[in-house]
Interface confidence: medium
């Protein structure tokens, strides 16, 4: 806590400038009004303050806001967002994507804090839900940002808001997260034809079910492996050789590398081993000729 | 807007001093930095060192430190900077700069140290 | 004392992006640092780009940002333009010292 002592004749700050750096802690604490500094927040960035007097600053800001601080100031905290605890944060009523875009800026280049979480957090619940420009930003500052929410937050993303999402920002994803945003993403991207849908499509299709997969087949996709061994298993298992043939097109012969990876080992397990052979792949696994496949799961559901 | 005016060009002898001004107009001046950085023919640019007219106190780069002096005088909104004994390499354009930020700078002055 | 490392030179094309990179030592560019760039056109004065590592002084174009990672800043200017050919140099103010530190500058060439 810093002491209250009187400022010295003549150190009055008037305005927020570059004199104040060699204002002692006690002198900007005793000198500058903290009404002056709410307003002059926008200079404070253009001063390079050490961190013990961004504390001294925060401390003003805090003393005449204490119920949290106006947007209008946080647009303009800078640096001083660094200073900011999750606490701090929580009373703040963030509208504005300016706003968040300003905040984002200063913690660029860094993992995301406990201040940046609880940023978005406010803003998101502020929003009601995640639109595409908040999405676009978000995912422009942390690639990994929609996988870092839950299921249930991600309910909360609308169908359009799918059209700001690229690949690389589903790398994270979780299968119960791709179930949760597959849907979504097979409705935002319905209207577009075969080719395009399916390069928007790809990314999300871990999510995505037999029947959809079974679909896909009959369209000349050529899925290639990588996108393959993402896919959900129990999606993948009831898939016949063909269909996997014609969903992978040139790249089935990819299958023989991955043989010992689910799902296509999974897979293998489940084929006729004679219609395995019909590959030519070398693929080993399958049920021999003569056996009898039980569908346990199917007789469950009628009983 | 803000606007630094320096002097004209000077030509020097190895082992003289030369002394270029900066003239501060239409906004604050005593409270914000004037720095002086120089820039040698197809070289980068070298900070020299600054000064807060208000406080008075200059600081320098080391490099230059005891052969630069950079003054201010509140009253004319002007800000110095001194360079002493010449030699060959000190050949090229100073610039004066405002705020730590620089930024607004000065026209530029060509010192050249031939003999 | 501090110093800071710029490629000596970069090109793109008109319309591409491109980054230039400026990179010290943990002292200088690593947790809180002041870093600033500057824009300077052949017999012209230097122009400030950037301060504070991402603020755009008014008047510049959004097309040029500013970040940092470690010890490393960058200046992304995206969409080139032929008026961005010129020289470019990264500053960094040093707490300990006072001092500010250029780098040696970058120059541009947009194809």
């Known amino acids: 806590e810093v002491e209250k002592t009187a400022c010295p004749s003549g150190k009055k700050a008037r305005e927020i400038d570059e004199s104040l750096i060699f204002y002692k802690k006690w002198e900007l604490e005793a000198c500058v009004d903290a009404a002056l500094l709410a307003t002059q927040m926008d200079r404070v960035n253009a001063i390079p303050f050490t961190y013990e007097q961004l504390d001294v600053l925060k401390h003003k800001l805090d003393e005449l806001y204490p119920q949290g601080y106006p947007e209008s100031v946080i647009q303009h905290l800078g640096y001083l967002f660094l200073k900011m605890s999750p606490e701090d944060i929580r009373k703040w009523n963030v509208t504005s994507l300016e706003t968040l875009k300003a905040l984002l800026e200063v913690n660029k280049g860094h993992e995301m804090s406990p201040q940046v979480a609880t940023l978005i957090d406010r803003f998101v619940k502020g929003r009601g839900q995640l639109d595409k420009d908040t999405l676009d930003t978000l995912t422009a500052f942390y690639p990994g940002y929609l996988c870092s929410l839950s299921p249930e937050e991600l309910s909360s993303v609308p169908p359009s808001s799918i059209w700001a999402v690229r690949p690389q920002d589903l790398d994270t994803c979780d299968p119960r997260q791709l179930d949760v945003l597959y849907p979504k993403a097979r409705l935002a991207f319905q209207n577009m034809n075969g080719s395009e849908y399916f390069v928007k499509i790809q990314s999300f299709l871990g999510g995505a079910p037999t029947e959809d997969l079974k679909a896909l087949s009959q369209q000349n996709v050529s899925m290639d492996l990588a996108t393959f061994m993402k896919l959900r298993t129990d999606a993948v298992l009831p898939l016949t050789v063909a269909e996997v043939q014609k969903l992978l097109g040139p790249h089935v012969e990819g299958l023989k590398a991955e043989e010992r990876h689910r799902p296509v080992r999974d897979w293998i397990l489940r084929q006729r081993q004679d219609d395995l052979d019909t590959l030519g792949l070398g693929l080993q696994g399958g049920i021999p000729n003569g056996y009898l496949v039980l569908d346990l799961s199917m007789q469950e559901a009628l009983s | 807007q803000v606007q630094l005016v320096q002097s004209g060009a000077e030509v020097k002898k190895p082992g003289s001093s030369v002394k270029v001004s900066c003239k501060a107009s239409?906004?604050?001046?005593?409270?914000?930095?004037i720095s002086w950085v120089r820039q040698a023919p197809g070289q980068g640019l070298e900070w020299m060192g600054n000064?807060?007219?208000?406080?008075?106190?200059?600081n320098y780069a080391q490099k230059f430190q005891g052969r630069v002096t950079i003054t201010a005088d509140e009253s004319t909104s002007t800000a110095y900077m001194e360079l002493s004994s010449l030699r060959s390499e000190d050949t090229a354009v100073y610039y004066c700069?405002?705020?730590?930020?620089?930024?607004?700078w000065g026209q530029g002055t060509l010192v050249t140290v031939s003999s | 004392d501090i110093a800071l490392t710029q490629p000596a030179s970069v090109s793109g094309s008109p319309g591409q992006s491109i980054t230039i990179s400026c990179t010290g030592t943990?002292?200088?560019?690593?947790?809180?640092?002041?870093v600033s760039w500057y824009q300077q056109h052949p017999g012209k004065a230097p122009k400030l780009m950037i301060y504070?590592?991402?603020n755009r002084p008014s008047g510049v174009s959004n097309r040029f940002s500013g970040s940092k990672s470690g010890n490393t800043a960058s200046l992304t200017i995206s969409g080139l333009q032929a008026e961005d050919e010129a020289d470019y140099y990264c500053s960094s103010y040093d707490y300990v010292s006072s001092d500010t530190v250029f780098g040696g500058g970058t120059k541009l060439t947009v194809l």
């Open positions: 239409g906004g604050t001046f005593s409270n914000y930095t």
């Open positions: 700069a405002r705020k730590f930020t620089f930024d607004v």
């Open positions: 000064i807060i007219p208000a406080f008075g106190y200059a």
């Open positions: 504070n590592v991402n």
């Open positions: 943990s002292s200088d560019l690593g947790g809180y640092s002041y």
